[in-house]
């Protein structure tokens, strides 16, 4: 739940985090996001 | 694709330095850059991130210690008031991945 | 911010045997894990990201697992070149609040 959320000009402001991205491949043009376990 | 950081050298404590991460192969535009340092004989330190939109994020310990910045092909970390605490090797790294430069070494000394 | 505790600082093996590292997270970072191998003047290798997923060229003598706050790294059949400095690092990411990129202690790998 996003309920503590609070935007301005469009952007997330708080306590969403923004995972770093993932480059698995090293030298190619890739990513690969670590996308979260469903529990 | 590579990284390479520049600037380390001997400074003496409360003169800035900035330290440059050269990027070839691709564009910082599309991608997110990690600072990280590493005193001698220790571990692993991250600093800050910028994410490939530009926005900045530190460590606690590093916040007002540090800034980061970026231009299309480089990435600047800058120290601002450098303490003989801030001895380490410098890294810039392309997220997380293997693209790691070798390291610029940053000396603080009176 | 994220803390990550690594555990424990020093192992010592012998060729062929198994070394288990620990990582503990101050908070739930999902999968939100990688693991560096560092080897003495040079800068750190990836290993594992996504807590389990091997990286490119990585053998699977390496294996990764947990989520959430506890997290393993499991060394099997292990080899002379395995000797070594292992770090865990959380990528969750960051908030205005909280840094979330924070790499454990390290862990030493010595092998007989």
């Known amino acids: 739940s996003y309920s503590m959320e609070h935007f301005r000009w469009g952007k997330p402001v708080g306590k969403k985090r923004r995972p770093v991205k993932v480059y698995p491949n090293g030298a190619e043009d890739e990513s690969a996001e670590a996308f979260p376990l469903e529990f | 694709q590579s990284v390479e950081e520049s600037g380390g050298r001997l400074v003496t404590p409360g003169t800035p330095l900035t330290l440059t991460c050269t990027v070839s192969?691709?564009?910082?535009?599309?991608?997110?850059m990690i600072w990280v340092r590493q005193a001698p004989g220790k571990g692993l330190e991250s600093i800050g991130i910028?994410?490939?939109?530009?926005d900045t994020y530190y460590a606690s310990w590093a916040k007002g210690r540090f800034t980061i910045s970026q231009t299309s092909t480089t990435v600047d970390l800058k120290i601002i008031s450098p303490t003989t605490e801030d001895t380490a090797t410098y890294f810039c790294?392309?997220?997380?991945?293997?693209?790691w430069g070798q390291g610029t070494l940053v000396t603080v000394s009176s | 911010d994220v803390v990550m505790t690594q555990t424990p600082a020093s192992v010592e093996a012998a060729v062929g045997g198994t070394v288990t590292i620990k990582c503990q997270a101050s908070?739930?970072?999902?999968?939100?894990l990688a693991w560096y191998q560092q080897k003495t003047g040079q800068p750190p290798k990836l290993l594992i990201y996504?807590?389990?997923t091997l990286a490119s060229g990585v053998p699977s003598r390496f294996k990764g697992s947990g989520s959430g706050t506890e997290f393993t790294l499991t060394i099997s059949d292990l080899e002379c070149a395995d000797a070594a400095t292992y770090y865990c690092?959380?990528?969750?990411?960051?908030?205005?609040?909280?840094?979330?990129?924070?790499f454990g202690g390290g862990t030493e790998v010595v092998v007989k």
């Open positions: 910028i994410y490939d939109d530009g």
């Open positions: 908070q739930s970072i999902s999968n939100y």
């Open positions: 790294v392309k997220g997380v991945s293997n693209i």
């Open positions: 996504s807590a389990s």
């Open positions: 690092q959380s990528y969750e990411g960051s908030s205005s609040s909280s840094y979330g990129v924070g």
């Open positions: 192969g691709f564009s910082l535009s599309k991608y997110d």
